[in-house]
Interface confidence: low
């Protein structure tokens, strides 16, 4: 049950059997506590006072590694190591594609300890932003035959786990590509910044009028973009160009981390876009090309002096990383 969180973990890819059952779990915000010390985790579970209570936390000793902390019938807190690798999560040799799936599996399908399942999620005292995000301050071209990924200045990444020596396994939000990047070329993104920043279709800094102008000038028929709603902070608007006009659709986040549009629920705005690429958004029209963020919108100022960083890592040109 109890694990040592101090082990060094690393590795690019796993071939374990994946658990692929439709599993339901409570929303992330009811059980995910972010980076949390083991002692405090035990305190929170004991305060909850019910056997079968659980939470998931990021190990404070090993960033990128997670721990499932569980209060057993014996009133003992057990800590189970969860290894996050390349977007998958491993516990006891089983692979899950999300922490929610893992929770669902040990809530409904299998026992965590003999005769004991996950019963009661323990919510954090305050909301947690669970995924670290970074932004490229310089462009980079991958070294051939490695797990690295190429990227552009301004690309945003979700950090899945931090590997040894300053490398990170990430997803590029613009391209959805997963791979290795090195920390020298990225900067932290503030928690207050919109989580969709970096998606090719997201325009966080433009007005409603600029959205219309972009669709009419840069865009074509069936082009689209998403921007934050003016009327309701926290909501989004999907702007879509038809032959006649620009149509606007409201997207509302829900308390359990889903998004609602047109009475239907989706796991992400990306899923909404994928849906309406295949299904008509208005009669005779499908979403086609997003209008990408324009140069003048770049939130990064272009005065970042990359010379020192590139010298440090021996970058000769933008397109050939190593000598």
């Amino acid at each position: 049950g109890t694990v040592d969180e101090g082990d060094s973990l690393d590795g690019p890819e796993y071939e374990e059997e994946e658990v692929a059952i439709p599993l339901t779990a409570p929303p992330t915000n009811q059980w995910y506590h972010g980076k949390l010390d083991r002692t405090i985790a035990e305190e929170r579970l004991r305060q909850a006072g019910k056997s079968g209570s659980y939470l998931i936390r990021e190990s404070d000793r090993r960033p990128g590694s997670f721990v499932l902390s569980f209060l057993s019938q014996m009133n003992v807190v057990n800590h189970f190591r969860i290894i996050a690798m390349c977007g998958d999560y491993y516990i006891g040799g089983r692979r899950f594609s999300s922490l929610s799936d893992l929770i669902g599996y040990y809530s409904h399908v299998s026992c965590l300890l003999k005769g004991e399942k996950l019963l009661y999620p323990v919510a954090p005292p305050e909301p947690v932003e669970d995924r670290r995000r970074v932004r490229a301050i310089l462009p980079y071209t991958k070294v051939p035959d490695t797990d690295e990924i190429s990227f552009l200045k301004g690309d945003m990444f979700i950090v899945h786990n931090e590997l040894e020596d300053g490398w990170m396994w990430v997803t590029n939000l613009r391209t959805d590509e997963q791979g290795l990047i090195v920390e020298d070329l990225v900067e932290e993104v503030g928690r207050e910044e919109d989580p969709h920043e970096g998606k090719i279709w997201f325009h966080g800094k433009i007005s409603k009028q600029e959205a219309y102008n972009l669709l009419m000038t840069v865009g074509q028929v069936c082009s689209f973009l998403v921007r934050p709603s003016d009327n309701t902070p926290g909501d989004y608007s999907l702007y879509f160009r038809t032959n006649e006009n620009i149509q606007r659709f409201k997207i509302c986040p829900t308390p359990n981390n889903q998004f609602m549009m047109g009475g239907r629920y989706y796991n992400s705005i990306g899923d909404i876009i994928d849906h309406y690429r295949k299904e008509q958004i208005v009669e005779g029209y499908y979403l086609k090309e997003p209008v990408p963020m324009q140069d003048q919108e770049q939130v990064l100022n272009d005065t970042v002096d990359g010379k020192e960083i590139y010298n440090t890592i021996r970058r000769k040109t933008k397109d050939a990383f190593y000598k």
């Epitope: 060094s8 690393d10 690019p12 374990e16 690295e148 040894e164 020596d165 090195v182 021996r314």
Partner: antibody, heavy 117, light 107 residues
């Protein structure tokens, strides 16, 4: 093209120390870590330690008290020093570049160290 | 510390045969395993990393499989130049450790 080249005195005295330099080209020491591995005559491979790209080190516990690995990024050199030599330290010593997460993708050609009085 | 056990310690095969060698880890190392070939008097060369991924320029007759604690390296259609020693390496956190090796000879 990535290359690593070890150079050292070849001969060491018992109880003395030996220093080996690994000179690298084709990549930067501030981007990739360098590991050290040795192979005693007729034996297998033994991992000794690593200097990570940020300058931190990890050593095989068996060598912790007498091994030191340092580097000079600007000269593209890694320095390996093993103290309190014993005859069973006689081996071929290799430096190797860290590939992706973990494994070594390119090795030096090795340098022979013989410990003898 | 994690131990790696390779078997067999030596094997003899004819040109054109398929040979398989195994590496067992003392605990779950997921796919954090690499295979190396070492010819007499030469440095080791990377064959496979992450248990199944071929190294750069490695002939397609070499393939790795397995995860967790059991791993295999298979050589299809053995060539004369394949003789030498083969080592597995775990990189599931330091200290890294090599297996004892498999000596491959041709009949």
């Amino acid at each position: 093209q990535v290359q690593l080249q070890e150079s050292g005195p070849g001969l060491g005295q018992p109880a003395q120390s030996i220093s080996i330099t690994c000179t690298v080209s084709g990549f930067s020491l501030s981007s990739y870590g360098v590991h050290w591995v040795r192979q005693s005559p007729g034996k297998g491979l033994e991992w000794l330690g690593v200097i990570w790209r940020g300058g931190g080190t990890d050593y095989n516990a068996a060598f912790m008290s007498r091994l030191s690995i340092t580097k000079d990024n600007s000269k593209s050199q890694v320095f390996f020093k093993l103290n309190s030599l014993q005859p069973d330290d006689t081996a071929m010593y290799y430096c190797a570049k860290r590939g992706g997460p973990g494994y070594f993708d390119v090795w030096g050609q090795g340098t022979t160290v013989t410990v003898s009085s | 510390d994690i131990e790696l056990t390779q078997s067999p310690a030596s094997l003899s095969a004819s040109v054109g045969e398929t040979v398989t060698m195994t590496c067992r880890a003392s605990e779950n190392i997921y796919s954090n395993l690499a295979w190396y070939q070492q010819k007499q008097g030469k440095s080791p060369q990377l064959l496979v990393y992450a248990a199944t991924k071929p190294g750069n320029g490695v002939p397609s007759r070499f393939s790795g499989s397995g995860s967790g604690t059991q791993f295999s390296l298979k050589i299809n259609s053995l060539q004369p130049e394949d003789l030498g020693n083969y080592y597995c390496l775990h990189f599931y956190g330091t200290p890294y450790r090599f297996g004892g090796g498999t000596k491959l000879e041709t009949k």
